[in-house]
Amino acid sequence: TEVKVIQPEKSVSVAAGDSTVLNCTLTSLLPVGPIRWYRGVGQSRQLIYSFTTEHFPRVTNVSDATKRSNLDFSIRISNVTPEDAGTYYCVKFQRGSPDTEIQSGGGTEVYVLAK
């Protein structure tokens, strides 16, 4: 059965300066390949977080993604600014050269409220 990427919240609101959690769960880890978070769609989408060895300021994983059975790929964005507003997608890739996108979550829109 094909892996599904579940983003349960269609939108979240967060006050500037606060942190927010964007939830994402997978129904399977197979086929093997990375999971990445993007803001926006298409060619101009911005990589927000990758569950590899890379480091991303202000963005951390919520659960212990080093668990071999982990299916929770939620992230926390800290010290949110108005520039962080947008729709965030959790995306599953199949390994390859380059990796191939096989499934995306439905997206979670982040609204940033003035403090």
């Epitope: 197979l30 060895t53 050269s97």
Partner: antibody
Framework: DVQLVESGGGVVRPGESLRLSCAAS????????MSWVRQAPGKGLEWLAG????????YYIDSVKGRFTISRDNPKNSLYLQMSSLTAEDTAVYYC???????????WGLGTLVTVSS | ALTQPASVSANPGETVKITCSGG??????YAWYQQKSPGSAPVTVI????KRPSDIPSRFSGSASGSAATLIITGVRVEDEAVYYC???????????FGAGTTLTVL
């Protein structure tokens, strides 16, 4: 620089126990899963056990389940392998290794020799 | 089980390919580990199929397709003599495995 230094090896008798340690430095230890791998004399590499970064999840090869226990102390930047009911077949060099995001290995320790002999 | 040739040999400057078969492309990631003498610390030359650690020379590369992975050494050197172990992680079983090792001799 990433450094992994094993200790605790030595000569023990069959049936005895031993605890190996691995001291980690040069990286954020609490962010990485870790594993133990061994190499018997004249043989190849054999993965034994792995542990998640937080220490809550452990994984073992069938042949050591129930005899070996992997654990870690993140504040001490240390990884452990508790071995019991040792037999001559457990004689090997034991390596600790840091895992990549997909549970392969990117850094290895120098190893510690365990000899089980009567 | 991962299967690789017991030995390969080459002259300096030649290209060496070592294959590793037996994994499932759907569930297995591959790595290659170099061991210059028995009991010495292995060195990772390739992980995640084709990722080369920053301190590994660019003559080492890797690929994977179907049920096999390949380590390629382009312009092999005498100092590349070693045993090369293919390693795999199976996301279905959560288990790591190794091939039996390939002894590379540079003539």
């Amino acid at each position: 620089d990433v450094q992994l230094v094993e200790s605790g090896g030595g000569v023990v008798r069959p049936g005895e126990s031993l605890r190996l340690s691995c001291a980690a430095s040069g990286f954020t230890f609490s962010s990485y899963a870790m594993s133990w791998v061994r190499q018997a004399p004249g043989k190849g590499l054999e993965w034994l056990a792995g542990i998640s970064a937080g220490g809550s999840d452990t994984y073992y090869i069938d042949s050591v389940k129930g005899r070996f226990t992997i654990s870690r102390d993140n504040p001490k930047n240390s990884l452990y392998l508790q071995m019991s009911s040792l037999t001559a077949e457990d004689t090997a060099v034991y390596y600790c290794a840091r895992e990549t995001w997909n549970h392969l290995f990117d850094y290895w320790g120098l190893g510690t020799l365990v000899t089980v002999s009567s | 089980a991962l299967t690789q040739p017991a030995s390969v040999s080459a002259n300096p400057g030649e290209t060496v390919k070592i294959t590793c078969s037996g994994g499932d492309y759907y569930s297995t990631y591959y790595a290659w580990y170099q061991q210059k003498s028995p009991g010495s610390a292995p060195v990772t030359v390739i992980h995640s199929d084709d990722k080369r650690p920053s301190d590994i020379p660019s003559r080492f590369s890797g690929s994977a397709s179907g049920s096999a992975a390949t380590l390629i050494i382009t312009g092999v050197r005498v100092e590349d003599e070693a045993v090369y172990y293919c390693g795999g992680y199976d996301g279905r079983t959560y288990i790591n495995t190794f091939g039996a090792g390939t002894t590379l001799t540079v003539l």
